[in-house]
């Protein structure tokens, strides 16, 4: 029971985590314009992995995709790659873990096979979570570096009295979503690995004991008991649950208000 709960919880936590990684990857707010100690602009800039957006104080938002592949910074490409690898591994892990769930019966699958699948999915979730955390952390590091570089020359003279304000970027919501999601996927993976230990059939080799009856000789071999009877699979009492994994197709974003003045 505890094993089933651990496995089920691990699956659910990982599912939430992977959904979060997907959401973070798609989000536009990886970096947002720093409003602190900055001249108050009627334009708010924010950037994602795939496009950059400008929200005007009039309420209009314009987003432009990065239509170049070679012109993008190597770090951004690396972050994209890490996030995609994380999503792919997580998705495969979810697929594997569905079949590995103790509460789902598929044919005459051995517990050892389920244990192996649980371990595989657990490792996949761990790697997926690490990829997401790494990707978000690389991006965050890039932001911090750029932030201090732009702070050093925040106001650059444009000949005479005219000044140009350099836009500084700080951590966007997607970074926090990514960190949390990566962490959840990692935790889910660890839980799956723990559940795997409980699922693995313990190979206890008892010596075959012979009982001699008066009429004829019958040998009971406890070692082969599980395989010979139907009790190992508990087919009578098993409730088969259809894994109804819900996916959220749409993340509704409400316009956040920035009171600039």
């Amino acid at each position: 029971m505890a094993v089933t709960a651990c496995q089920g919880l691990g699956f659910v936590v990982s599912l939430i985590g992977i959904a979060g990684i997907i959401a973070a990857t798609c989000m536009d707010q990886w970096s947002t314009q720093d409003l602190y100690n900055n001249p108050v602009t009627a334009v708010f800039n924010y950037q994602g992995l795939w496009r950059s957006c400008v929200r005007e104080s009039s309420g209009f938002t314009e987003c432009r995709g990065y239509f170049t592949l070679l012109g993008l910074p190597a770090m951004l490409q690396a972050v994209r790659a890490l996030m995609i690898v994380g999503i792919v591994l997580g998705a495969i892990g979810l697929l594997v873990s569905i079949f590995a769930l103790k509460c789902i019966r598929i044919g005459s699958m051995e517990d050892s096979a389920k244990a192996n699948m649980t371990l595989t999915s657990g490792i996949m979730f761990i790697v997926s979570g690490l990829c997401a955390i790494a990707g978000v952390s690389v991006f965050a590091n890039m932001l911090v570096t750029n932030f201090w570089m732009s702070t050093a020359n925040m106001y650059t003279g444009m000949g005479g009295m005219v000044q140009t304000v350099q836009t500084r970027y700080t951590f966007g919501a997607a970074l926090f979503v990514g960190w949390v999601a990566g962490g959840l996927t990692l935790i889910g993976g660890v839980m799956m690995c723990i559940a795997c230990r409980g699922l693995a059939p313990e190979e206890t080799n008892y010596k075959a004991v012979s009982y001699h009856a008066s009429g004829h000789s019958v040998a009971y071999k406890p070692g082969g008991f599980k395989a010979s009877t139907g009790f190992g699979s508990n087919t009578k009492n098993k409730k088969i649950y259809d894994g109804g994994a819900r996916t959220e197709d749409e993340v509704q974003s409400y316009p956040s208000k920035h009171d600039y003045v």
Epitope: V43, Q47, F60
Partner: antibody
Framework: EVQLQQSGPELEKPGASVKISCKAS????????MNWVKQSNGESLEWIGN????????TYTQKFKGKATFTVDTSSSTAYMQLKSLTSEDSAVYFC???????????WGQGTSVTVSS | DIVMTQSPSSLTVTAGEKVTLSCKSS????????????LTWYQQRPGQPPKLLIY???TRESGVPVRFTGSGSGADFTLTISSVQAEDLAVYFC?????????FGTGTKLELR
Amino acid sequence: EVQLQQSGPELEKPGASVKISCKASGYSFTGYKMNWVKQSNGESLEWIGNIDPYYGDTTYTQKFKGKATFTVDTSSSTAYMQLKSLTSEDSAVYFCARYNRGNTMDYWGQGTSVTVSS
Amino acid sequence: DIVMTQSPSSLTVTAGEKVTLSCKSSQSLLNSGNQKNYLTWYQQRPGQPPKLLIYWASTRESGVPVRFTGSGSGADFTLTISSVQAEDLAVYFCQNAYFYPLTFGTGTKLELR
């Protein structure tokens, strides 16, 4: 056709209050913020602030905080600006203007003249 | 606050003449996010409200004659009227649409000789 119809001229005594209206038609009223602009004796224009009719959020310039108050009535697609504690400095023509892409004011009301005189 | 300086304050021209109005900002109005200059030009004819002519420094508002052209970047902007018509006699205002509070220039009055 987009139209912004403002209320008629006002003659007020110092210390009094005045409420100017701006009725919008020809577009989705809640889809655009409404700006208010002051023009003293035909000279330059001065931005007072704006209101988002959808959320009711208001933005005021420092100078007009406490002086001007924006409100909206979405059922009648009307924006209002109230000016308190009037002085001769408040004598001007006040415009409402729709806020659009590029932070522009693309449609303007005809203006409401406010005269403060004892 | 951002100071918008327009020059000249008034200009007397003849019909058909090419006119260039200048507008300088105390800070750059270029937004790095979309590489657009948040400068707007308005025309105000006598007894009328202002009318939007140009936004994003060079984008002509629909219905505005092609003789009106906006140019410039950063903090230096110009409005050019290629061939002045009688109906162009008005006051022209430039506006900072990038920094709060939104500020207007003092205006350039265009008069016919």
